[in-house]
């Protein structure tokens, strides 16, 4: 649908996008689950956090994640002022001082302890190609999304806009 190399054009200038404020415009505490209703859980093991994708037992409490929404200006190749519009970027924090990070070298998603200002690896561009599902695209690597691979979170390359609807990069947010 997009002509030039799918997602690369679709998200052409993420590297150049700048977050317009150091404060989030809103924050949202939610549990994170896959398109197939498996829960994303976080466990402290050997002084570091592990991330799991698993079926929860009945009545087992879901882990919550704090999603912080930031606005980011998007450079334009069309509009005269050089700014086409705004994107929403999110950071995801399951516990105080820990944030999800994209490790592009290892194609992995990791929890890192860090202080603000957060590094670019902690920011993900928010997409929703379904009304009730979201996807998270790496700010540092356009066209690469958080996805599910072998019951773990991983970074998955999406090579065309049609594949933005692929189930393994779709996540559901819920308050319960």
């Amino acid at each position: 649908a997009f002509g030039i190399s799918g997602v690369q054009k679709y998200t052409r200038a993420l590297h150049d996008s700048s977050i317009t404020g150091i404060s989030p415009i809103t924050e949202y505490l939610a549990s994170l689950s896959t398109y197939n209703d498996q829960s994303i859980t976080f466990a402290l093991e050997d002084e570091s956090y592990e991330i799991y994708v698993e079926d929860l037992k009945k009545d087992e409490k879901k882990d919550k994640v704090l999603l912080s929404y930031y606005e980011s200006q998007h450079p334009s190749n069309e509009s005269g002022d050089g700014v086409d519009g705004k994107m929403l970027m999110v950071t995801l924090s399951p516990t105080k001082d820990f944030w999800l990070h994209a490790n592009n070298k290892e194609h992995s998603v990791e929890l890192h302890k860090c202080e603000k200002p957060l590094p670019d690896q902690a920011f993900f561009v928010l997409h929703n190609m379904h009304s009730n599902c979201v996807s998270f695209e790496c700010k540092t690597d356009p066209g690469v999304f958080i996805g599910v691979k072998d019951n773990h979170l991983a970074l998955i390359k999406v090579d065309s806009s049609e594949n933005l609807c692929t189930e393994n990069i779709l996540f559901k947010l819920s308050e319960t």
């Epitope: 649908a1 190749n77 069309e78 086409d84 519009g85 705004k86 928010l126 929703n128 806009s161 308050e175």
Partner: antibody, heavy 121, light 106 residues
Framework: EVQLVETGGGLVQPGRSLKLSCKTS????????MYWIRQAPGKGLEWVSS????????YYPDSVKGRFTISRDNAENTIYLQMSSLRSEDTATYFC??????????????WGQGSLVTVSS | EIQMTQSPSVLSASVGDRVTLSCKAS??????LDWYQQKLGEAPKLLIY???NLQTGIPSRFSGSGSGTDCTLTINSLQPGDVATYFC????????FGGGTKLELD
């Protein structure tokens, strides 16, 4: 400058069909959710349809589901609303709107001026 | 489907007044709420997004607040140009408008 211009409205008999167009300019059309919203004379706003940036998913309220179809042409920067089996209660001004943010269905950042559809015999 | 209820449906106020408009959702909408202003014969215009963020170019006398199911639009020091109908809009689950509040001058 962002512009959205609706065309195709007019007088139509009950049970007949009509197709609205919304031609846009001034933004990267293929990266935005797009919407149709309507307003009956003297009444409030009613969401009518939404479409994702790549056109792969479309959404409707029960009041128009099965009768209205939203579509888009990303090469022409245009969205459409095909309305069939029209009823008198579909009489309204139809606005197209663009999402406020790239890639997400949050907020209606810009609206067109609207196109009046009158369903009457 | 989430229902959005605005009150009052009509509000009369004087220039300089502080005006408060209410919007109540039938379930938690997680601050996924906008306010739109529609003047007579015009298209609606985005004023406030994500409950409390002012859209570029909108005067600072407009502000939004709230969480959960209850949200409020406040206009500090009402101006003649603020006469309009104001609609709330949720996008937490589907898309729904409130019925609107028509703001008039005394």
């Amino acid at each position: 400058e962002v512009q959205l211009v609706e065309t195709g409205g007019g007088l139509v008999q009950p049970g007949r069909s009509l197709k609205l167009s919304c031609k846009t300019s001034g933004f990267t059309f293929s990266s935005y959710w797009m919407y149709w919203i309507r307003q009956a004379p003297g009444k409030g706003l009613e969401w009518v349809s939404s479409i994702t940036p790549n056109g792969g998913n479309t959404y409707y309220p029960d009041s128009v589901k099965g009768r209205f179809t939203i579509s888009r042409d990303n090469a022409e920067n245009t969205i459409y609303l095909q309305m069939s089996s029209l009823r008198s209660e579909d009489t309204a001004t139809y606005f197209c709107a663009k999402g406020h943010y790239y890639y997400t269905s949050y907020s209606l950042g810009y609206w067109g001026q609207g196109s009046l559809v009158t369903v009457s015999s | 489907e989430i229902q959005m209820t605005q009150s009052p449906s009509v509000l009369s106020a004087s220039v300089g007044d502080r005006v408060t408009l209410s919007c109540k959702a039938s379930q938690n909408i997680n601050k996924h709420l906008d306010w739109y202003q529609q003047k007579l014969g015009e298209a609606p215009k985005l004023l406030i997004y994500f409950t409390n963020n002012l859209q570029t170019g909108i005067p600072s006398r407009f502000s939004g607040s709230g969480s959960g199911t209850d949200c409020t639009l406040t206009i500090n020091s009402l101006q003649p140009g603020d006469v309009a109908t104001y609609f709330c809009f949720q996008y937490n689950n589907g898309w729904t408008f409130g019925g609107g509040t028509k703001l008039e001058l005394d």
